[in-house]
């Protein structure tokens, strides 16, 4: 067991050209606090993946309010070290993730809003009892330094903190099959320990807090006898003796998750869904505390000050979990309308609305007349999130402004011929037609088809189309 | 796991219509949180978005400005399927044509999933 | 043609890193999350970042996005020579109301 110790030093932007603009303004002060994620091996699994070797989060820093003008400065930063306890044997490599979040302390409604304004990551070779390792990492413009180091808690010493030392018992020498303990020469190595409740009949460890079964047993703390009797669900070889299929031990099998934890089976392995006031790979840390840093996410950590009382994490937008630990997919819910597409920014839902709609959901359809003029008389009509125009007689286009040229759908019937008049067309009809579009064909006894003509025009005159 | 098959000719003359296919599997085209996309890539242009097309209740297509006129996206929901059509083609639009998907719940702008890309020459 | 802005080139060591920018304007990356690609020779792009900052499962988290206003930018940490390839920022434009890439850049191992 021990302890990775993580010291920011600065936050601030990185050498060279394009400044970042400061997080924080008058109008937005903020604050920054960092989480870590550590993750056992040179892991390249996502950012998201479970941060098997722990996680912590940082306190608030002091709060922040840019200087108008003034490029930003290495930011102020949260007091003390991140630490992240682990319980098993410090690995000697492992990958980091390192996490800076603003928290924005606006008029905001339903309390501070979080972003995440850099994430920076690496792997690296680190052997516990170690000095203090530097590093400096940068997210794009923003650039991060920071020290580290793991070291063990009592009583295990070395470099993976697997060796226990105790007191000498004789001041002489150390037990049988123990050696003294360097460099702490009048302490002597202890014998193994095996996880708590491992069963002395079958099981046994080959390191500290390990339990591993002998066959025919399974379990986390080889309890639980494998089944021959049943060949139901088979998982494993055949076995020679009973000629059934013996099930393999499953990843779930006999619940790898202590203090409550559900188990449920990956691709690779299992994951244990804990219980509040237990987190790690199997809910074996218990007696959890803000102070340990258990709110995943950015998540903001409440009551818990001592190990018997609960805490409990508020969780940022798009994430719940006792730990904050589950994203939440909160666009498969469909909130938008209209054919939005949602948009899960993480702090933020956000829908973005097809043409003529608006609103949170694009609920609204815009009433595009409202405000909008159609030109030269023409009058507005609505449809379908769209605003048109149905223009006047010789206007056209969107918002009627063009000059339409009134003869271009030849209007005239039975081969009258169009002339363009600056108060709308004139059809001159052929001979046998009139009207105002030549419509009306003159009955051979003089007769129109019309009760009779316009004073002042004959059958055969230009009709004026008002 | 989601695999996107493109389908159609790699040569067209100048002025006709050229048409390509997506075959999806392990997604359907009717998905309520993916969108189903065309984009093209040339030496001369890069990387261009050409077209997409969704359901969400209905379906809804949307197009690049530059080539809405010339352009048609078609969900076939009986192939499970989504097709492209390029009227009038030039040798400008000489390409590599790809169809992709904008799959992840909460960020469709970002395309996850990509067909094999289809040459496509314009020459007579 | 492209609406966002690219260096064409950059280059580094193994084990080095290398930072790619990408600027564009109020429309795009100013107000929509930026995705960024990576296209190896002969192949169709892969989503190599999406949101500012996810990562699809299988991307290591050497890269890493951030952004800043009007601009984004591609940090490749501990260059590996698997990484030379062609990088593309990607955003929504709301002004053209479409997708809008980047002019690409060419990473060199050397």
């Known amino acids: 067991a021990g302890v990775f110790e993580l010291q920011i030093h600065s936050f601030g932007p990185g050498p060279g050209p394009g400044a970042p603009r400061s997080p924080c303004s008058a109008r937005l002060p903020c604050r920054l606090f960092f989480r870590v994620c550590l993750k056992p091996g040179l892991s390249e699994e996502a950012a998201e993946s479970p941060c098997a070797l722990g996680a912590a989060l940082s306190a608030r820093g002091p709060v922040y309010t840019e200087q108008p003008g003034a490029p930003a400065p290495d930011l102020p930063l949260p007091d003390g070290l991140l630490q992240v306890p682990f319980r098993d044997a410090w690995p000697g490599t492992f990958s980091f993730i390192i996490e800076t979040w603003r928290e924005e302390l606006g008029d905001q409604i339903g309390g501070p809003a979080w972003s995440l304004l850099a994430r920076v990551a690496g792997r690296r070779r680190l052997a516990a009892g170690g000095p203090w390792a530097r590093d400096i990492q940068r997210a794009g413009a923003w650039e991060l330094r920071f020290s580290y180091r793991a070291r063990c808690e009592p009583p295990a010493v070395g470099t993976a903190c697997t060796r226990l030392c105790r007191p000498r018992s004789a001041p002489s020498r150390c037990g049988p099959g123990l050696r003294p303990c360097a460099p702490l020469e009048d302490e002597c190595e202890a014998p193994l320990v095996c996880r708590a409740g491992c069963s002395p009949e079958h099981g046994f460890c080959e390191q500290p807090g390990e339990c591993r079964c002998l066959e025919g047993w399974t379990g986390p703390l080889c309890t639980v006898p494998v089944s021959t009797s049943s060949c139901l669900s088979p998982r494993g070889p055949s076995s020679a003796t009973t000629g059934c299929l013996v099930p393999g031990p499953g990843p779930c099998d006999g619940n790898p998750c202590a203090n409550g934890g559900s188990c449920s089976e990956t691709p690779r392995s299992f994951e244990c869904t804990c219980p509040r006031g237990f987190y790690g790979l199997r809910c074996e840390v218990s007696g959890v505390t803000c102070a340990d840093g258990p709110c995943f996410n950015g998540g903001l950590c409440v009551g818990g000050a001592d190990p018997d009382s609960a805490y409990i994490c508020h969780c940022p937008p798009g994430f719940q979990g006792s730990n904050c630990e589950k994203r939440v997919d909160r666009c498969s819910l469909q909130p938008c309308r209209n054919g939005g597409l949602c948009l899960d920014l993480g702090h933020a839902l956000r829908c973005r609305c097809r043409a003529g709609f608006a609103g949170p959901r694009c609920e609204h359809d815009l009433d595009d007349c409202a405000g909008r003029a159609c030109a030269n008389g023409g009058t507005c009509v609505e449809g379908g999130g769209a605003h048109r125009c149905s223009c006047a007689l010789g206007f056209g286009g969107r918002d009627c402004r063009e000059r339409a040229d009134p003869c271009a759908a030849r209007p005239c019937a039975h081969g009258g011929r169009c002339y363009a008049h600056f108060s709308g067309l004139v059809c001159a009809c052929a001979p046998g037609y009139m009207g105002a579009r030549c419509e009306f064909p003159v009955h051979p006894d003089g007769a129109s088809a019309l009760p009779a003509a316009p004073p002042g025009l004959r059958p055969g005159d230009p009709q004026r189309y008002l | 796991q989601v695999q996107l098959q493109q389908s159609g000719p790699g040569l067209v003359k100048p002025s006709q219509t050229l048409s390509l296919t997506c075959a999806i599997s392990g997604d359907s085209v009717s998905s309520n949180s993916a969108t189903w996309n065309w984009i093209r890539q040339s030496p001369s242009t890069g990387l261009e978005w050409l077209a997409r097309t969704y359901y969400r209740s209905k379906w809804y297509n949307d197009y690049e400005v530059s080539v809405k006129s010339q352009i048609t996206i078609n969900p076939d929901t009986s192939k499970n399927q989504f097709s492209l059509q390029l009227n009038s083609v030039t040798p400008e639009d000489t390409a590599v044509y790809y169809c992709?998907?904008?799959?992840?719940?909460?960020?469709?702008?970002?395309?996850?999933?990509w067909g094999q890309g289809t040459m496509v020459t314009v020459s007579s | 043609q492209s609406v966002l802005t690219q260096p064409p080139s950059a280059s580094g060591t193994p084990g080095q890193g290398v930072t790619i920018s990408c600027s564009g304007s109020s429309s795009n990356i100013g107000s929509n999350p930026v995705n960024w690609y990576q296209q190896l020779p002969g192949t169709a792009p892969k989503l190599l970042i999406y949101?500012?900052?996810q990562r699809p499962s299988g991307v290591p988290d050497r890269f890493s996005d951030s952004k800043s206003g009007t601009s984004a930018s591609l940090a490749i940490s501990g260059l590996q020579s698997e990484d030379e390839a062609d990088y593309y920022c990607?955003?929504?434009?709301?002004?053209?109301?479409?997708?809008?890439f980047g002019t690409g850049t060419k990473v060199t191992v050397l």
């Open positions: 992709a998907r904008g799959g992840i719940v909460g960020a469709p702008d970002a395309f996850d999933i």
């Open positions: 990607s955003a929504w434009d709301d002004w053209l109301n479409g997708y809008v």
């Open positions: 949101s500012n900052n």
